[in-house]
């Protein structure tokens, strides 16, 4: 249960994680388990321990074998093995089962690819993306932080993918590549960043003062069940439970879907007895997903009262 | 934009709780749309929970009945109370920020440098 596997490559960085996690505060040691020598902490060495991380800078294909790491704490001790292989560079494009990461899919409206493990190391952007070996080219791919992303995902965009970037310690700098594969599925469910309905953006209302006004926030999601999506009225940038005033309430509509399968929802903004000084105030319908938030603004004006006189 | 620092996180037992905090500062807080991320080692970060106004909170389904989101607006700080834990909810856990801006990408919410959560025995 306390062991992990970690692989790299010759002559490129590779840091490991000791399965085994504590507070901060907690002393790590790691031991060769073959020989039970202690692993130096100094940096000067190219293979070292810091703390929860053992590194490798670079790493050789005779450091391959099981490392064993010990968290201590006043308390108690726990141990941790992590068993480590590294490989020679191919010399060929392929890339073999066992240096892969696990595989992602993507559909056509989320095809996020993650790098794996850079969470590790100390990196900075841009990644640089291959696929198959071939640097990705083109508006479609976006390096975005520590994910690729593929617009308008076609099946043709499965296939291994490869992310490369540099770790730095100490002014020294050393590449790490990393792949796992791509696979589309065609999904039936799907999300996409919020499209407001209604109100238009920036769209004038008019109501009559001491009458009732309600203004309706409707957006769309995508289709099928959304993981996260709302819709909610603010008045001055503020949320309609802080602003403080009961005469305006906020009430959820009925959920919609449509017969295209979109997932829509409702909000219905009720002001009662409106006044003059409602007409002051910006009304902001936000749409929100995990893909972002949209917000349409809307103003209220008076409604001329029609002159009856000939 | 709005600076998070996130605190609470720390090894607990299968079954133990924690509370973690999000203080908020630099932007207006009670117009910002609060909430909690998580990140489990070699795994794409994954929506916890979020706190839309004081009535209005969503989760996902894994943490559903076990987690709660709260804000507190005197202090610009979200929480996330988390019971019943279980080894499979060990991961960094972010808190994020959104609000402003007339449309807004995941990417550009503000995010917290996050906490580590570890379930384990």
């Known amino acids: 249960k306390f062991s992990k596997q970690s692989w790299g490559l010759e002559n490129e960085a590779l840091i490991v994680r000791c399965p085994r996690q504590g507070k901060p505060s907690y002393t790590v040691d790691w031991y060769y388990s073959q020989t039970n020598k202690s692993i130096p902490t100094q940096e000067r060495n190219r293979v070292f321990a810091s703390g929860q991380l053992l590194k490798f800078l670079p790493a050789a294909v005779a450091d391959s074998g099981i490392y064993t790491c010990i968290v201590r704490s006043p308390t108690f001790n726990r141990t941790g093995y992590a068993n480590v292989t590294i490989y020679k560079k191919q010399s060929d494009c392929n890339v073999p089962d066992y240096l892969m990461y696990s595989t992602v899919s993507g559909s056509e409206k989320n095809s996020k690819i993650y790098c794996p493990t850079i969470d590790l190391y100390n990196w900075t952007a841009p990644l640089e993306w291959f696929k198959n070996c071939q640097a990705l080219q083109g508006s479609r791919y976006r390096a975005h932080k520590s994910f690729l992303v593929i617009d308008n995902v076609m099946t043709e965009d499965a296939g291994d993918y490869t992310c490369k970037f540099i770790h730095n310690e100490n002014g020294a700098n050393y590449s790490v590549t990393a792949t796992r594969s791509f696979t589309v599925k065609d999904e039936q469910g799907f999300s996409l960043f919020p499209v407001i309905g209604a109100p238009a953006q920036n769209e004038i209302k008019e109501v009559e003062i001491g009458k009732n006004a309600n203004l309706t926030c409707s957006a769309c999601f995508g289709k099928g069940t959304q993981f996260l999506a709302a819709v909610l009225w603010q008045l001055n940038g503020t949320k309609i439970t802080d602003f403080g005033e009961p005469r305006i309430q906020q009430e959820e509509g009925q959920n919609q879907s449509f017969s295209n399968g979109l997932a829509c929802l409702d909000m219905v903004l009720r002001i009662a007895d409106v006044k003059e000084e409602d007409l002051l105030l910006q009304y902001d319908c936000l749409a929100l997903n995990l893909h972002g938030l949209r917000r349409h603004t809307v103003r209220l004006s008076r409604k001329n009262p029609i002159d009856h006189h000939s | 934009e709005v600076q998070l620092v996130e605190s609470g996180g720390g090894l607990v037992q299968p079954g133990g709780s924690l509370r973690l905090s999000c203080a908020a500062s630099?932007?207006?807080?009670?117009?910002?749309?609060m909430g909690w991320f998580r990140q489990a080692p070699g795994k794409e970060r994954e929506f916890v929970a979020v706190?839309?106004?004081?009535?209005?909170?969503k989760y996902a389904d894994s943490v559903k009945g076990r987690f709660t989101i709260s804000a507190d607006n005197s202090k610009n700080t979200a929480y996330l109370q988390m019971n019943s834990l279980k080894p499979e909810d060990t991961a960094v856990y972010y808190c994020?920020?959104?609000?402003?801006?007339?449309?807004?990408?995941?990417?550009?919410?503000?995010w917290g440098q996050g906490t580590l959560v570890t379930v384990s025995s």
């Open positions: 706190i839309i106004d004081s009535r209005t909170t």
């Open positions: 994020a920020a959104v609000g402003g801006a007339t449309t807004v990408t995941a990417s550009e919410w503000d």
């Open positions: 630099g932007s207006t807080f009670s117009n910002a749309v």
